[in-house]
Amino acid sequence: TPEVWVQVRMEATELSSFTIRCGFLGSGSISLVTVSWGGPNGAGGTTLAVLHPERGIRQWAPARQARWETQSSISLILEGSGASSPCANTTFCCKFASFPEGSWEACGSLPPSSDPGLSAPPTPAPILRADL
């Protein structure tokens, strides 16, 4: 069964800066990745970035840099000031559309006890939705 993992990290140098990393553990080819915050995409969440493996990347504030890390994982740097700034309990979600598995989405947030610059190793987050 495919899985999605999400890792959220606060940068030590800038406390309003977050790095979100997401990955897809499956054998299919990824056709699209959507990163949102405040909840799952399409369920109250706000899209931060959309990444297509070949067409390109679209991102919106406070996203600063979205990129592919590997063929099955992405990272997104957020920096905010004021209303658009993420906070420690913000939920970030990643939705991977793949063929033939369908869409798989998972969410994560900063571990409650984590120090700036530290985070738990990326582990598969609970799968919220699988749209086949």
Epitope: T46, T47, V50, R55, G56, W60, W68, E69, Q71
Partner: antibody, heavy 114, light 113 residues
């Protein structure tokens, strides 16, 4: 298949504003950004910016910041581009596009002339 | 901003012959993470909007004839029409799809010799 239908040609005076609409059908309007591109007569293509209809998040080309505003109405699947303080150099065909420029509107000619 | 420079500005090719258009970017369009080049090619005929031909430097958009092909990596890219047809007369643009703002080449006008 996504279809984008734009509003008709406009003739405007220098200093005024123009609002161009782009109505989408055949796809999920809120999922992908609507891009705006212009093309002056006999010239190349210039990206103005984009809006993500679902959240009204925007990105603007620095060249147009402060003069252009993007809005979107999810209820009618329509995106709008308003360009203010028009000058003769803004005479161009304005296009909306979606899904990484795979789909395009037919274009709207905006003529700025006194 | 990434500057896209096409060559030649105009090109005349006989029907059935090969047409080649080059595009050079001022920065690499290669995403090292997934080894994909974020470059697109468009065809524009008079009075029409641009039509996407190629994305990811070499992937043909659905419905595009296989006589169109794209190649290249990093900063140097090529659009090739293997056997020119009359309906291929148009202006062709390359585009940076790697980073904001998306920027286009100045265009190459393709005519029949």
């Amino acid at each position: 298949e996504v279809q984008l239908v734009q509003s008709g040609a406009e003739v405007k005076k220098p200093g005024s504003s123009v609002k161009v609409s782009c109505k989408a059908s055949g796809g999920t309007f809120s999922s992908f950004s609507i891009e705006w591109v212009r093309q002056a007569p006999g010239q190349g293509l210039e990206w103005i910016g984009e809006i993500l209809p679902g959240s009204n998040s925007t990105n603007y080309n620095e060249k147009f910041k402060g003069r252009v505003t993007f809005t979107a109405d999810e209820s009618t699947s329509t995106a709008y581009m308003e360009l203010s303080s028009l000058r003769s150099e803004d005479t161009a065909v304005y296009y909306c596009s979606s899904y990484w420029f795979a789909y395009w509107g037919q274009g709207t000619l905006v003529t700025v002339s006194s | 901003d990434i500057v896209m420079t096409q060559s030649p500005d105009s090109l005349a090719v006989s029907l059935g012959e090969r047409a080649t258009i080059n595009c050079k970017s001022s920065q690499s369009l290669l995403n090292s993470g997934n080894q994909k080049n974020y470059l697109a090619w468009y065809q524009q005929k008079p009075g029409q909007p641009p039509k996407l031909l190629i994305y990811g430097a070499s992937t043909r958009e659905s419905g595009v004839p296989d006589r169109f092909s794209g190649s290249g990596s990093g900063t140097d890219f090529t659009l090739t029409i293997s056997s020119l047809q009359a309906e291929d007369v148009a202006v062709y643009y390359c585009q940076n799809a790697h980073s904001y703002p998306p920027t286009f080449g100045q265009g190459t006008k393709l005519e029949i010799k």
